[in-house]
């Protein structure tokens, strides 16, 4: 499914992607009167540093070698932040003393940018993406994708790390954004809503699809994540909205199928290797493309987001096992892991097609 | 030294039964799958059986499947092929290999052990 | 007969270059899965010479090297030496059979 870009030919539901429209304070729910379940903010854990929280964990990137068994990675740390379905907050929780990011969580306090300042910049995402408001950009080609096919062995490593669901990702998979602009991924995760609740962190005039999946890379001029952290184009997230479609995804199936064994918070399982990109819309050419943030602590910038404009289809009870499977810190489900909506504050989203 | 070595091949009759070890050591076993792969006389490579790292998912190529199992016990960083109901066709060196390069390639092999099956 | 299709025998004069393919299909190679190639001397086991269509093991001279496009791969040897006479096998996964196939096998020959 595709997102419309005029407003005449369409009601949201099919595509997947938005425009360039920061979300005014109404989105933003306060503090108080922010729900635990609403939007909470968070994004992607970068892997790295232990004491580099992100987007959701980050795995550490090390050079090249013959016998890369598996690609350590270091859960960055976690922060939660109180939400609304659809209007998340920008809060965390710090369970430790001192500049830790690595508890936080959904909706609670302290706010976000005590957790990490960066959270409070001026670039930060998601954002409402408005098709109409979108600058066409012929420059922006279609991307590419390499080796993202992976065999079933070595598995991979499947983890609830108590703010999403994430799946590291081995040496080897390239991105290109086009010429120059190179990328290895790292880690895949998901945002979700709840039983009847969207839960996508982007949303496209304002329609909040019912989930998101991001996957996360780094700049192939730098070697670790926390170089990258905060410089423009060190990393890029690849975001595609999921919506409900009436057949069962057979590529997201593989990952689903495993959600029970991973419902604690913390715990991990092993998956067989599968297509990454098949987990991915299959038109790589149309997207829009804008320079933010991760959605977590530490909300760092210059982080280049590309949204896809087609969607991503599973089936209902596939969303279903998605929003209602996993737990968090507590007793908590972990339900509702988006981030608020962010202000553009002048910056305007580019569209690969007119 | 990071190396595999092999033990259990000789002759058996068709229909017979055979067990392969395969003792790992110089790397972490325990964290690699690792396949059996054989090469019949003057004949080319072909790919057996595999098993993750913690032996919960294995896989098998057709010509072997329901008469080959494939097991590992990670505590003696051994892996095993257990072959029932042999064939003259099963005749070949058997290979084994460590699973471990993301990409599917299998960078450490056993010297391999030579399992004829003849009446 | 393999999925895999390699040339049974290629061969070069010392100092030359030679190259070896493998050609696949849209359930292998042309579906993305790496190709990976393989070195068998005589007698000995295989060695692990080129993975991920292009990386060469440490250890592995740099007149080998690896290339893939659409659903065939190759290897190149530059400079070629008398210790280079072996078997190589080239080798991907194959999504349809579910299965890690070897080519058949090309003999290398130094005159």
């Known amino acids: 499914q595709r997102l419309p870009r005029m407003q005449e030919d369409s009601p949201l539901g099919g595509g997947s992607s938005g425009e360039d429209d920061p979300l005014g304070e109404e989105d933003l729910p306060s503090e108080e009167d922010s729900p635990r379940e609403e939007d909470p903010p968070g994004e992607e854990d970068l892997p790295g540093e232990e004491d580099l929280p992100g987007e959701e964990d980050l795995p550490e990137v090390k050079p090249k070698s013959e016998e890369e068994g598996s690609l350590k990675l270091e859960d960055l740390p976690t922060v939660e932040a109180p939400g609304d379905p659809q209007e998340p907050q920008n809060n965390a929780h710090r369970d430790k003393e001192g500049d830790d990011q690595s508890h936080w969580r959904y909706g609670g306090d302290p706010p976000w940018p005590r957790v990490s300042p960066a959270c409070a910049g001026r670039f930060q995402s998601p954002v409402d993406i408005r098709p109409q408001l979108a600058a066409f950009c012929p420059a922006l080609r279609p991307l590419e994708l390499l080796g993202f096919q992976l065999p079933p062995l070595p598995e991979l490593r499947l983890r609830n790390n108590g703010h999403s669901v994430q799946l590291t990702l081995p040496p080897g998979l390239e991105m290109a954004l086009g010429p120059g602009r190179e990328y290895r991924a790292l880690q895949l995760h998901l945002h979700w809503g709840a039983a009847g609740r969207p839960g996508s962190e982007h949303t496209v005039e304002g329609h909040r699809f019912p989930a998101e999946i991001h996957v996360v890379h780094l700049s192939t001029a730098f070697a670790r994540v926390d170089e990258a952290l905060g410089r423009p184009g060190g990393l890029a997230v690849l975001a595609a909205f999921l919506e409900e479609g009436p057949e069962e995804n057979s590529a997201y199936e593989q990952l689903l199928s495993r959600l029970e064994e991973i419902a604690e918070e913390g715990s991990e399982t092993q998956v067989p290797g599968l297509d990454i990109s098949a987990l991915l819309p299959s038109d790589f050419s149309r997207y829009f493309q804008y320079e933010g943030s991760l959605t977590t602590p530490p909300c760092a910038q210059g982080v280049i987001w590309t949204v896809f404009n087609q969607t991503v289809m599973l089936s209902a009870k596939q969303l279903h096992t998605l929003s209602d499977t996993l737990w968090g810190p507590g007793d908590s489900r972990l339900q509702l892991n988006f981030r608020a909506t962010q202000p553009l504050n002048g910056r305007v989203i580019e569209a690969s097609f007119p | 030294q990071v190396q595999l070595v092999q033990s259990g091949g000789g002759l058996v009759q068709p229909g017979g039964s055979l067990r392969l070890s395969c003792a790992a050591s110089?790397?972490?076993?325990?964290?690699?799958?690792m396949s059996w792969v054989r090469q019949a006389p003057g004949k080319g490579l072909e790919w057996v059986s595999a098993i993750s790292a913690n032996g919960g998912t294995t896989y098998y190529a057709d010509s072997v499947k329901g008469r080959f199992t494939i097991s590992r016990d990670n505590s003696k960083n051994t892996l095993y092929l257990q072959m029932n109901s042999l064939r003259a066709e099963d005749t070949a060196v058997y290979y084994c290999a460590n699973n471990g390069n993301y990409r599917g390639a299998f960078d450490i092999w056993g010297q391999g052990t030579m399992v004829t099956v003849s009446s | 007969q393999s999925v895999l299709t390699q040339p049974p025998s290629v061969s070069g004069a010392p100092g030359q270059r030679v190259t070896i393919s493998c050609t696949g299909s849209?359930?292998?190679?042309?579906?993305?899965?790496?190709v990976h190639w393989y070195q068998q001397l005589p007698g000995t086991a295989p060695k692990l010479l080129i993975y991920g269509n292009t990386n060469r093991p440490s250890g592995v001279p740099d007149r080998f090297s690896g290339s893939k496009s659409g659903t065939s791969a190759s290897l190149a040897i530059i400079g070629l030496q008398a210790d280079d006479e072996a078997d190589y096998y080239c080798q991907s996964y194959d999504s349809t059979l579910r299965v890690w196939m070897f080519g058949g096998g090309t003999k290398l020959t130094v005159l």
């Open positions: 849209s359930s292998n190679i042309g579906a993305g899965y790496d």
């Open positions: 110089g790397f972490p076993f325990s964290s690699y799958a």
